[in-house]
Amino acid sequence: MMTGTIETTGNISAKKGGSVILQCHLSSTMAQVTQVNWEQHDHSLLAIRNAELGWHIYPAFKDRVAPGPGLGLTLQSLTMNDTGEYFCTYHTYPDGTYRGRIFLEVLESSVAEHSARFQIP
């Protein structure tokens, strides 16, 4: 039985050229997290954090994606094309797979605030 809950940073905004932290947190389960995958809106993989072998950044994103903090992901040098959904997928044992969603809006405005709050989707 899957008892866990994924908390995410929810809907966030950041300005073009800046950076943003994508964060998910799995709670309410004793399951072992074996791997966390980060995917983009078109389901292309950004990064993997394997519990035993560590971080792997997809080659196409290695200049713009930084691992962490924690199991989160930092996107840098944001462009308007980065606007969209991001997914964290927690692979756990014995529970199985948990998935969280974050929506990132990249704003042109120089006064755009980076708003991030933890919320349950």
Epitope: T34, H43, S44, L45, E52, I57, K62, H91, T97
Partner: antibody
Framework: QVQLVQSGAEVKKPGASVKVSCKAS????????MHWVRQAPGQGLEWMGI????????SYARKFQGRVTMTRDTSTSTVYMELSSLRSEDTAVYYC??????????????WGQGTMVTVSS | EIVMTQSPATLSVSPGERATLSCRAS??????LAWYQQKPGQAPRLLIY???TRATGIPARFSGSGSGTEFTLTISSLQSEDFAVYYC??????????FGGGTKVEIK
Amino acid sequence: QVQLVQSGAEVKKPGASVKVSCKASGYTFREYYMHWVRQAPGQGLEWMGIINPSIGLTSYARKFQGRVTMTRDTSTSTVYMELSSLRSEDTAVYYCARGGRTTWIGAFDIWGQGTMVTVSS
Amino acid sequence: EIVMTQSPATLSVSPGERATLSCRASQSVSSNLAWYQQKPGQAPRLLIYGASTRATGIPARFSGSGSGTEFTLTISSLQSEDFAVYYCQQYVVWPPLTFGGGTKVEIK
């Protein structure tokens, strides 16, 4: 050219251990993951585990945890797979296979010739 | 773990004909999918990686497509040397990395 050369066939008794070697040549040994895959007679391919030759980190399939140990010797560009507490169901051909660079998990582009391990009383 | 399911288990095809092999993942593997060919008594050989990129030295009659959970390997015109067992594999979630059960392509 890039190649992986494995040690010769082994016949073992139930309860014993076997250690298979895989010597790499033709590329920078430390830069690519190495995997071990086995194939029982007439059966499909079964992944056993992976080792990062640069730093020695490993990840094993849960099925083999506690029985398998993967190590490497960077001075000879050789990886080893030791399987203990052998039983008849471990009779199989054991392959080493080169994976992607250690920055990203890739497909298995180079395979050893295979080592037949027979477990019989 | 991600379960890879291949179909059909056996495919009977005449030389010169087209062969289409399917592979389904129990959850998305993005494009991190490989196809291997194995002949009796030999080690597997990488054909396709990244779901659609041919490995070095692989003839153009082999092509791969798909992403997410549904993938296809197509052999446009079967040659005698193509009769073998074909395996798909995901390499994005581990442990364990997982293979499909294989599709045997045999002469009709």
